[in-house]
């Protein structure tokens, strides 16, 4: 309740997160023209990426373009990229939608289609749909530990969400354990009224709100966080221009003295931790 006699001050906060969990991924792997089922294990280093600010990212799906080399090749025949003669291809042109610099030649992409040749990482990335169901759908069972230190400088008061009495094996529950700072990712989505399995395919942005309403008067002291969750990106993927949340990164290696890379288009959930609240003292 609003105590008018108190001097209020906004919270100053720092956040640190630690994600834990292992995922087993089964996907089709093509080697030498033969497609077979491949199994791989993903640990924290494989699916989380350091982000700036109060955010962390968990990869839930991906599309790989393996063995790319910097050379010449036909560009992927996306809409509007096909050609019938060299006139359609402009030497030195860098189309923002393209993956390379045009050489000026119209070359065969396959049996029926021709596209402009480009100097690029080849073969150029295909426009593939994100796998469904998501490859790391088991990320639903990963957990994140959120460490949140807060400070009210005007009141010379510092505290944190993790208490010495807390059990390291607890899991947050709105009713049974609302002060536990270890959250199961699937539970965060459930609390926000979202379907993890569905969002995991294209990715998305989830907000974890930590609200501190602190009464710092000694006779009625209370300063504990309240957690709530809501989806922050546009959930109507059919209507939104670029649905979900994804980015590309590459793993570089050398093979027979040729520099190669595996390009990975990573889809996943970016979790934004939003800390707000006030501290009041007479």
């Amino acid at each position: 309740s609003d105590k008018l006699y108190q001097r209020k001050e906004p919270v100053i906060s720092s956040v640190h997160t630690k994600v834990k969990g292992i995922a087993e991924v089964t996907e089709n792997v093509t080697e030498g023209g033969v497609t077979k089922l491949g199994h791989s294990i993903f640990d924290t280093a494989d699916y989380t990426f350091p982000l700036q600010g109060n955010s962390f990212f968990v990869m839930t799906n991906y599309v790989k373009s393996e063995g790319q080399v910097q050379t010449l090749c036909p560009e992927y025949p996306r809409r509007g990229a096909q050609c019938s003669s060299d006139r359609r291809c402009k030497k030195g042109w860098m189309d923002p939608q393209s993956k390379g610099i045009q050489t000026g030649r119209c070359v065969p992409y396959d049996k029926t289609r021709k596209t402009c040749e480009v100097s690029a990482w080849c073969p150029t990335e295909e426009e593939k749909e994100a796998p469904r169901p998501a490859l790391l759908r088991s990320a639903e069972n990963f957990t994140v530990l959120i460490k949140n230190n807060i400070h009210f400088p005007g009141h010379n008061y510092t505290t944190r969400n993790i208490l010495p009495t807390m059990n390291g094996s607890c899991t947050f529950h709105k009713t049974w354990d609302p002060q536990c700072s270890i959250f199961r990712l699937g539970d965060i989505f459930q609390e926000a009224g979202e379907n993890f399995t569905e969002v995991a395919v294209q990715g998305g942005i989830m907000g974890i709100e930590i609200y501190w309403d602190c009464n710092l008067d000694s006779w009625s002291h209370h300063c504990r966080p309240r957690y709530s969750f809501r989806r922050l990106d546009d959930k109507n993927t059919d209507e939104s221009f670029v649905p979900g949340y994804n980015f590309r990164y590459a793993k570089y290696y050398k093979e027979n003295n040729v520099e190669k890379r595996t390009l990975i288009k990573a889809f996943g959930i970016r979790f934004d931790i939003l800390v707000f609240g006030t501290g009041g003292k007479f």
């Epitope: 023209g33 050379t71 010449l72 090749c73 036909p74 030649r105 070359v107 065969p108 080849c122 040729v258």
Partner: nanobody, 115 residues
Framework: EVQLVESGGGLVQAGGSLRLSCAAS?????MGWFRQAPGKEREFVAG????????RYADSVKGRFTISRDNAKNAVSLQMSGLKPEDTAIYYC???????????WGQGTQVTVSS
């Protein structure tokens, strides 16, 4: 799927020459040659992009082998000179999306270099 037919293999003396040819059932951006010696892995020999641009050679054959393309015939040939016994292998024609990337291979033609 692209069909590839190789020809021109045979027995030749060290220092001699041989010309391998390959015809593809459809046009393709890159065509190249690989080889596999007994008990060894298949290795890249030479590759050519559309109209012969770019070309790429394995270090072991540079200056001795020349690859050439005939786009009109969907064909590629490999002129091999200064042959050595270590060039003995089954030579495979291949097609792909760049001079580094190949998806389809022919049945192969045997090249034997005697000393």
């Amino acid at each position: 799927e692209v069909q590839l037919v190789e020809s021109g293999g045979g027995l030749v003396q060290a220092g001699g020459s041989l010309r391998l040819s390959c015809a593809a059932s459809e046009r393709t951006y890159s065509m190249g040659w690989f080889r596999q010696a007994p008990g060894k892995e298949r290795e890249f020999v030479a590759g050519s992009g559309w109209d012969g641009i770019p070309t790429r050679y394995a270090d072991s054959v540079k200056g001795r082998f020349t690859i050439s393309r005939d786009n009109a015939k969907n064909a590629v040939s490999l002129q091999m000179s200064g042959l050595k016994p270590e060039d003995t292998a089954i030579y495979y024609c291949a097609t792909g999306t760049s001079v580094y990337h190949y998806q389809y291979w022919g049945q192969g033609t045997q090249v034997t270099v005697s000393s």
